[in-house]
């Protein structure tokens, strides 16, 4: 069974996404798995379905259970399951392990803590951040978009960080909190202008029509963990996600490697079932950090 765990606190908003993918135009039906009873789509209900999302506004402990989502896609309907657990609010400060999202690590050069699941909600900045239940105050802490930046990180900054924000639904406000652990790595390092190791500038890559092809964008940015370093691909100057060709996808998540002690990032561009029209596109490998941006261009040619 294709299922996903989700959790939340009573009297807070919880929004869950169907674990099966679908285009925005696809209808998604939600059901209580135990009773097979359909979940309403009318927003006046406390629990209602909204396309790929299931909304608990607010959640109650009794909402815990398995929910079925069926994506009404062409050819076959795709079924997913959301395993939802709603917990009672803790009276003390301790956040139990079962409420914790994945741990993140940081260093003096890189101290971003993302607020988990926030992309599912309709929220407005700024986020409130707490460490071990204490509101974070002082110029070292900066709430930026959906993450917290800590300047001059020290080992004492390790701990449990909670983000708190307000979800707005049709004029009504609901509180949401999410907690994750932050660990600090002691690291001496430096950053420099990005150096792209691959591909070479104006490289011609030979591909076979009808086969799959991979292009790797690889760049190094300095020594140690880097703050705001990224590599990505563009097609004809457009982000891959905006280009709209589903056969051409970036590999999710950037692979981090250390070459001769340098911090390097790879991003693989996967082209499924190469077509003639792919040969007409310009493929740009972009590497950027605080120092600036470097671009190497690749073109495809048909293998003889």
């Amino acid at each position: 069974k294709f299922s996903k765990q989700s959790w939340g606190l009573e009297n807070e908003a919880l929004i869950v996404r169907c674990p099966r993918q679908g285009k925005p135009s696809y209808t998604v039906d939600w059901y209580y798995s135990q009773t097979n009873k359909s979940i309403p789509t009318q927003e006046r209900n406390r629990v209602f379905a909204s396309g790929q999302l299931l909304k608990f506004l607010p959640a109650e402990v009794a909402d815990s259970g398995i929910y079925t989502c069926i994506v009404r896609s062409p050819t076959f309907n795709r079924t997913g399951y959301a395993n939802v657990t709603i917990y009672k609010k803790q009276s003390d400060c301790n956040v139990p392990d079962y409420l914790m999202y994945s741990t993140v690590s940081g260093s003096e050069k890189n101290s971003k803590i993302y607020c988990p699941t926030i992309d599912l909600y309709n929220w407005t900045a700024p986020l409130e951040w707490f460490k071990n239940c204490q509101a974070l105050q002082g110029s070292r802490y900066r709430a930026h978009k959906s993450f917290l930046v800590i300047d001059n990180v020290m080992t004492e900054d390790a701990g449990d960080y909670t983000c708190k924000f307000i979800h707005n639904e049709n004029g009504a406000n609901y509180s949401v909190t999410a907690t994750r652990s932050f660990t600090v790595k002691d690291e001496q390092g430096f950053s420099l202008f990005p150096v792209i190791g691959a591909p070479a500038q104006n490289e011609i890559k030979e591909v076979e029509i009808g086969k799959n092809a991979n292009l790797t964008c690889s760049a190094c940015f300095g020594k140690g963990t880097q703050f705001l370093a990224a590599v990505l691909w563009q097609l004809n100057g457009t982000k891959i996600t905006d280009f709209g060709e589903p056969r051409i996808q970036q590999e999710e998540g950037q692979n981090q490697s250390f070459s001769n002690g340098l911090a390097c990032l790879d991003m693989v561009l996967r082209i499924a079932d190469v077509k003639e029209e792919d040969l007409l596109l310009q493929y740009d490998c972009l590497a950027l950090n605080l120092h600036g941006l470097r671009r190497h261009t690749v073109r495809l040619s048909r293998k003889n």
Partner: antibody
Framework: EVQLVESGGGWVQPGGSLRLSCAAS????????MYWVRQATGKGLEWVSG???????YYPDSVKGRFTISRENAKNSVYLQMNTLRAGDTAVYYC???????????????WGHGTTVTVSS | DIVMTQSPLSLPVTPGEPASISCRSS???????????LDWYLQKPGQSPHLLIY???NRASGVPDRFSGSGSGTDFTLKISRVEADDVGVYYC????????FGGGTKVEIK
């Protein structure tokens, strides 16, 4: 080269069982739905089973309960277990590549050469 | 189940001349994403079928531009602008909106 190679066909008596295999190569197998389509001699094409990227399975009523499709992504393989076979199941069985990544549809763009199943006493 | 009906059953053609095959579905194949889930396949003698057209009008990779697909909803047409001797075989339409069902096929042969 993108290809699908079927095996496991043969002669079997009515009520018997057979397991067909399909070995895929040249593409990211785990990202695609896979189907089996059959064709009786001199007849048209009939879809007999499908399996999606997460292993959910789909069948027409004509084979439901008798045929089971499965996949082994680590081996780039898809299988069709056929039980309680009937004379009407006699056909060439094709392994076919289908939908990419749950919802990107490019047609059934790769077909194997087929393997022949004969059910008779 | 969606039923697919093709016509004609048999189509004698002259090389260099155009040819047209019709396919009708028992319900609309136009989905909410704006696509018609209708494909065309050609099975040449002694070979496996291969894809010609997907989603009503998109030519598959490597398919010559003399093949074109058109139509929407329940009525679809495959056109060959100038038939070549290599185009002989059985042409099938297939719907992919609700599971998969094929038309009965149209046999194209040289006059």
């Amino acid at each position: 080269e993108v290809q699908l190679v079927e095996s496991g066909g043969g002669w079997v008596q009515p009520g018997g069982s057979l397991r067909l295999s399909c070995a895929a190569s040249g593409f990211t197998f785990s990202s695609y739905d896979m189907y089996w389509v059959r064709q009786a001699t001199g007849k048209g094409l009939e879809w007999v089973s499908g399996i999606d990227t997460v292993g959910d399975t789909y069948y027409p009523d004509s084979v439901k309960g008798r045929f089971t499709i499965s996949r082994e992504n680590a081996k780039n393989s898809v299988y069709l277990q056929m039980n309680t076979l009937r004379a009407g199941d006699t056909a060439v069985y094709y392994c076919v590549r289908g939908i990419y990544g749950d919802f990107y549809y490019y047609g059934l763009d790769v077909w194997g050469h087929g393997t022949t199943v004969t059910v008779s006493s | 189940d969606i039923v697919m009906t093709q016509s004609p059953l048999s189509l004698p053609v002259t090389p260099g001349e155009p040819a047209s095959i019709s396919c009708r579905s028992s319900q609309s194949l136009l989905y909410s994403d704006g696509n018609n889930y209708l494909d065309w396949y050609l099975q040449k003698p002694g070979q496996s079928p291969h894809l010609l057209i997907y989603l009503g009008s998109n030519r598959a990779s490597g398919v010559p531009d003399r093949f074109s697909g058109s139509g929407s909803g329940t009525d679809f047409t495959l056109k060959i602008s100038r038939v070549e001797a290599d185009d002989v075989g059985v042409y099938y339409c297939m719907q992919a909106l609700q599971t998969l069902t094929f038309g009965g096929g149209t046999k194209v042969e040289i006059k």
